[in-house]
C-alpha cells in the first residue's frame, strides 16, 4: 500500500513524493534502498531529497531502483518505498505503454486532459500540448491551468496526449514531458451540485467524553465517474492539517462508492478520546465539484448518562 | 491564527526591479497556495499570479508573464514576488493573500480555489524617476 | 480572461437598509464566486466563498446567491461598519479577476 511507482526519461527532471504522508514540520530521510545509503539533502547534488520530495535534476537511467522515505514526527515513524525507472528516450514517435499515465475518458460536455504530476513540479504556464507527437494548434485546443480543454471533442481527438513544461530549480530548467491516453465516449455520465448525505445541515452529534468519535462526510456528485470532486472537513473553517490537533484526523473512505446510481465520495473525521473543548469547536463536512461547493455544519454535545429515577 | 507579514514599502526608478517578501506564521506552510494581488492608488484589484508553497509551481497572469518572478523559502515560511521592467503605472499596493484550495480526490493536481482569506498589510511600491 | 462586471458601482444607503450588489461573469463560472469587503488603507476581507458561504467570523447580515453568470451579495440590515467598498472575484478559471467595485457610502 505505501510503495509507489514512478517512472521518467533521462535527461528530464523527475520529482519522486514520499508515499507516506506527513506534516510539513516532520522530517523525511531518504534512502537508496538496495545499500540503506542516505540520500543528501545539498541541491549541489543531481540526485537529492526536499522533504517529502525526492528529486532527479535530470534523471539518468542508473537512477532506477527502489527508494525508502521514512517520516519521522515525535511520537511515530513512517516509512514508504518509491520504485523509481528511469527510461532512455525513444527515437521514434511511439510512446511505449509503461511510460503512460492512467488513461482519461472525455465526452462532448467534459474534455478535460491533465498533465500528470504537474504539481510535484514548479512550473510556468502555458503548458505545451501535444496528440501523437504533433503540437496541438486552434482555437479548440485550451491550455487551462494545469489541464488541456477541448472544445467540441470528436471521437477522432482520441489518442495519445502529451504535456511538455520546465520545471524551474534555482535558477536551472529542466524538460519533463508526461504522455496520457484520451478516449472518447459517449455522453452517459454527468455531474450535478454536490449533495451532501451525511451529515444532516447543522446536525448536533452526541458524543461521550473520554470515548472515540467518527464523523463521515459523505456526498454524491452525479453519475459516472467523478474525476473532479472532492470532499473534506475543516475544523473552525479550518483545514484539518492545520489545525494541530493529532487527535483529530481524517480518513479516506472507498475512492467512489455508489448509491442509487449516483457516485458518491465520503471523508470519516476520527476523534480520539474527545475532550470537553472538541464541543465548542465547529466541524464543516465540504462537498465540491466544477459545479460549486456544499457545506453542511456540525456540532458535538456530550451524551448525557441516561437518568435512572426511582 | 495564520499570519502574513509582508515588507516594507520601496521606491524605485523606472526599469529597476523590486522585490516583495512575504512571511507566514502560525499555521502549516505549505498547504496552502499564496496569491499576489496589487492595487492601483484609487484603483480596484488586480491578480498577478499564484504560487503553490509545496512544489513551488506557480501560474502568472499573462499581463505580467516575463516581468513577474515568485519563488519561496519553506526553510522561513515566507514567499516572494519579484516585479522587473517597473513603470510609473507599476506604482501600488501590493498585497499576498492566502488562496484556500481543495484537491479533487480522483484527480489530486486538480486544485480548487475558492477564496483569499487572509492577507498581508500590503507593500507600498512607488516607482517615480 | 473572464470579465466580471459589477453594479452599482456606488451606492448611497441608511443604516438599517437592505442592500443588494450585483456581479456578471462574462461566461458561466458555475458557483466559484467570492465576495470581498475593503475599507480605506487597509487590506481586503473574506465574506463570502463559492457564491453562498459565509467566511467564518462574518456577521449573518451577509449573505451570497446566484450561480452560473449572474451573483448578488445581500447586506440584510446595514450597520456602521458595512460602509466599505465590495469586490466580487471569480476562481473558476486563471487569471483570477475582480469586480470593479461597489462603493457604499452612508446617505
Known amino acids: 500500500k505505501f510503495s509507489k511507482q514512478s517512472w521518467g526519461l533521462e535527461n528530464e527532471a523527475l520529482i519522486v513524493r514520499c508515499p507516506r504522508q506527513g506534516k510539513p514540520s516532520y522530517t523525511v530521510d531518504w534512502y537508496y534502498s538496495q545499500t540503506n545509503k542516505s540520500i543528501p539533502t545539498q541541491e549541489r547534488n543531481r540526485v537529492f531529497a526536499s522533504g517529502q520530495l525526492l528529486k532527479f535534476l535530470p534523471a539518468a537511467v542508473a537512477d532506477s531502483g527502489i527508494y525508502t522515505c521514512i517520516v519521522r514526527s515525535p511520537t511515530f515513524n513512517r516509512t514508504g518505498y518509491a520504485n523509481v525507472t528511469i527510461y532512455k528516450k525513444q527515437s521514434d514517435c511511439n510512446v511505449p505503454d509503461y511510460l503512460m499515465y492512467s488513461t482519461v475518458s472525455g465526452s462532448e460536455k467534459n474534455s478535460k486532459i491533465y498533465c500528470p504530476t504537474i504539481d510535484l513540479y514548479n512550473w510556468t504556464a502555458p503548458l505545451e500540448w501535444f496528440k501523437n507527437c504533433q503540437a496541438l494548434q486552434g482555437s479548440r485546443y485550451r491550455a487551462h491551468k494545469s489541464f488541456l480543454v477541448i472544445d467540441n471533442v470528436m471521437t477522432e481527438d482520441a489518442g495519445d496526449y502529451t504535456c511538455k513544461f520546465i520545471h524551474n530549480e534555482n535558477g536551472a530548467n529542466y524538460s519533463v514531458t508526461a504522455t496520457r491516453s484520451f478516449t472518447v465516449k459517449d455522453e452517459q455520465g454527468f455531474s450535478l451540485f454536490p449533495v451532501i448525505g451525511a451529515p444532516a445541515q447543522n446536525e448536533i452529534k452526541e458524543v461521550e467524553i473520554g470515548k472515540n468519535a467518527n464523523l463521515t462526510c459523505s456526498a454524491c456528485f452525479g453519475k459516472g465517474t467523478q474525476f473532479l470532486a472532492a470532499v473534506l472537513w475543516q475544523l473552525n473553517g479550518t483545514k484539518i492539517t492545520d489545525f494541530g490537533e493529532p487527535r483529530i484526523q481524517q480518513e479516506e473512505g472507498q475512492n467512489q462508492s455508489f448509491s442509487n446510481g449516483l457516485a458518491c465520495l465520503d471523508m470519516v473525521l476520527r476523534i480520539a478520546d474527545v475532550k470537553e473543548e472538541d464541543l465548542l469547536l465547529q466541524y464543516d463536512c465540504l462537498a465540491l465539484n466544477l459545479h460549486g461547493l456544499r457545506r453542511h455544519t456540525v456540532r458535538l454535545s456530550r451524551k448525557n448518562p441516561i437518568d435512572h429515577h426511582s | 491564527q495564520v499570519q502574513l507579514v509582508q515588507s516594507g514599502a520601496e521606491v524605485k526608478k523606472p526599469g529597476a526591479s523590486v522585490k516583495v517578501s512575504c512571511k507566514a506564521s502560525?499555521?502549516?506552510?505549505?498547504?496552502?497556495?499564496i496569491s499576489w494581488v496589487r492595487q492601483a492608488p484609487g484603483q480596484g484589484l488586480e491578480w498577478m499570479g499564484r504560487?503553490?508553497?509545496?512544489?513551488?509551481?506557480?501560474v502568472y497572469a499573462q499581463k505580467f508573464q516575463g516581468r513577474v518572478t515568485m519563488t519561496r523559502d519553506t526553510s522561513t515560511s515566507t514567499v516572494y514576488m519579484e516585479l522587473s521592467s517597473l513603470r510609473s503605472e507599476d506604482t501600488a499596493v501590493y498585497y499576498c493573500?492566502?488562496?484556500?484550495?481543495?484537491?479533487?480526490?480522483?484527480?489530486?493536481?486538480?486544485?480548487?480555489?475558492?477564496?483569499?482569506?487572509?492577507w498581508g498589510q500590503g507593500t507600498t511600491v512607488t516607482v517615480s524617476s | 480572461d473572464i470579465q466580471m462586471t459589477q453594479s452599482p458601482s456606488s451606492l448611497s444607503a441608511s443604516v438599517g437598509d437592505r442592500v443588494t450588489i450585483t456581479c456578471r461573469a462574462s461566461?458561466?463560472?458555475s458557483s466559484w464566486l467570492a465576495w470581498y469587503q475593503q475599507k480605506p488603507g487597509k487590506a481586503p476581507k473574506l465574506?463570502?466563498?463559492?457564491?453562498?458561504n459565509l467566511q467564518s467570523g462574518v456577521p449573518s447580515r451577509f449573505s451570497g446567491s446566484g450561480s452560473g453568470t449572474d451573483f448578488t451579495l445581500t447586506i440584510s440590515s446595514l450597520q456602521p461598519e458595512d460602509f466599505a467598498t465590495y469586490y466580487c472575484?471569480?476562481?473558476?478559471?486563471?487569471?483570477?479577476t475582480f469586480g470593479q467595485s461597489t462603493r457604499l457610502e452612508i446617505k
Open positions: 472575484q471569480q476562481s473558476y478559471s486563471t487569471p483570477v
Open positions: 493573500a492566502r488562496d484556500t484550495s481543495i484537491a479533487a480526490r480522483l484527480n489530486p493536481d486538480y486544485y480548487y480555489y475558492y477564496g483569499m482569506d487572509v
Open positions: 465574506l463570502i466563498y463559492a457564491a453562498s
Open positions: 502560525g499555521g502549516t506552510f505549505s498547504s496552502y497556495a
Open positions: 461566461q458561466s463560472i
Open positions: 504560487i503553490n508553497p509545496n512544489s513551488g509551481g506557480t
